[in-house]
Interface confidence: low
């Protein structure tokens, strides 16, 4: 899957473009918008009725190293007592993200640009029923 | 990948930071990916706190299209169908990792930016303050 | 702005016990908080433990496994590293930081506390 070119005509590439190899491209991993503040309602992955729980990834290799990860913690969802209830499903909800991974060959590095599929939380469905002829 | 002579000895590489800068092959590595949500899942219907997904879209950004997720309710749908407010439907927020064409429209030249994106919804007990 | 602060570090001997604290203050720590390390002559930081608010420990490096686990008091705005049988590979400058989502950086980091352990 290639990054597609920009196709539209007002978008000409500028003088200003820094030289590139072909076949690559040039990748400033700082990061914008580092510090920019999220505002989460408190405790959700407890609070759900499809709760989850994290856990973190690490690999050196990968910017970022960290990846974070929810596992439901139910096949089921929690009802108003409290209990698992089995007819109602708690599934995964996902979002892809970009990480660059650096691989090396021999006494060499590169680095090739990565989307991972991250879970970020877990939600409550009713199931599909699939019925028998 | 775009191949970068090491230093002579050949360090052990664990040790050494990502630089600030790096060529990277065009090919994301990928396989199975789908971006469009209303494709890959119908989740957005079937839950109980269910959502609208709306397309956000920047030509100047890999990738151009993000979907982001609107809860429909502020309760969440009961066994009956019906909305219950003693419940809420929430939006599940991921901080995700993007590409920034910088300097802008250069087509080869990228910084990474973090967004802050509505995944989806989830239904949640409410907090309840209870005033003295 | 927040900013953390380590404490707790010195100097002891292989198979001893040691606790380091770190506390935020003009803030409170994020969703997660974890304990990093860098050992003399690295230049690069190691994941040691990363905690999550509501206390569940969600890494653990493998080579500190067993030995060392991590604890938060939101009330005090306060994290712990518990380390227990430390070993001269453990002889590092410690780091405590913060962040909503490890997955695309720690947003604050104190300034680090040194442990040494000697045999």
């Known amino acids: 899957r290639k990054i597609p070119k920009v196709g539209h005509t007002f978008f000409q590439k500028p003088e200003s473009c820094p030289p590139v190899p072909g076949g690559s491209m040039k990748l400033d991993i700082g990061i914008i918008n580092e510090n920019q503040r999220v505002s989460m309602s408190r405790n959700i992955e407890s609070r759900s009725t499809s709760p989850w729980n994290y856990t973190v990834t690490w690999d050196p290799n990968r910017y970022p190293s960290e990846v974070v990860q929810a596992q439901c913690r139910n096949l089921g969802c929690i009802n108003a007592q409290g209990k698992e209830d089995i007819s109602m499903n708690s599934v995964p909800i996902q979002q892809e993200t970009l990480v660059v991974r650096r691989k090396h060959q021999g006494c060499s590095v590169s680095f090739q640009l990565e989307k991972v599929l991250v879970t970020v939380g877990c939600t409550c469905v009713t199931p599909v029923i699939h019925h028998v002829q | 990948g775009i191949t970068i002579p090491r230093n002579p000895g050949c360090p052990n590489s664990e040790d050494k930071n990502f630089p600030r800068t790096v060529m990277v092959n065009l090919n994301i590595h990928n396989r199975n990916t789908n971006t469009n949500p209303k494709r890959s899942s119908d989740y957005y219907n079937r839950s109980t706190s269910p959502w609208n997904l709306h397309r956000n879209e920047d030509p100047e950004r890999y990738p151009s299209v993000i979907w982001e997720a609107k809860c429909r309710h502020l309760g969440c749908i009961n066994a009956d169908g019906n909305v219950d407010y003693h419940m809420n439907s929430v939006p599940i927020q991921q901080e995700i990792l993007v590409l920034r064409r910088e300097p802008p429209h250069c087509p080869n030249s990228f910084r990474l930016e973090k967004i802050l994106v509505s995944v989806g919804c989830t239904c949640v007990t409410p907090i309840v303050h209870h005033v003295a | 702005e927040v900013q953390l602060v380590e404490s707790g570090g010195g100097k002891v001997q292989a198979g001893d016990s040691l606790t380091l604290s770190c506390v935020a203050s003009?803030?409170?720590?994020?969703?997660?908080a974890a304990w990093f390390r860098q050992a003399p002559g690295k230049d690069r930081r190691e994941l040691v433990v990363?905690?999550?608010?509501?206390?569940?420990?969600?890494y653990t490096a493998d080579s500190v496994k067993g030995r060392f686990t991590a604890s938060r008091v939101n009330t005090k705005n306060t994290v712990y590293l518990q380390m227990n049988s430390l070993k001269p590979e453990d002889t590092a400058v410690y780091y405590c930081a913060s962040a909503y989502n490890p997955g695309v950086g720690y947003d604050y980091w104190g300034q680090g506390t040194q442990v040494t352990v000697s045999s």
């Open positions: 003009g803030g409170t720590f994020s969703n997660y």
């Open positions: 990363s905690i999550f608010r509501t206390g569940s420990i969600t």
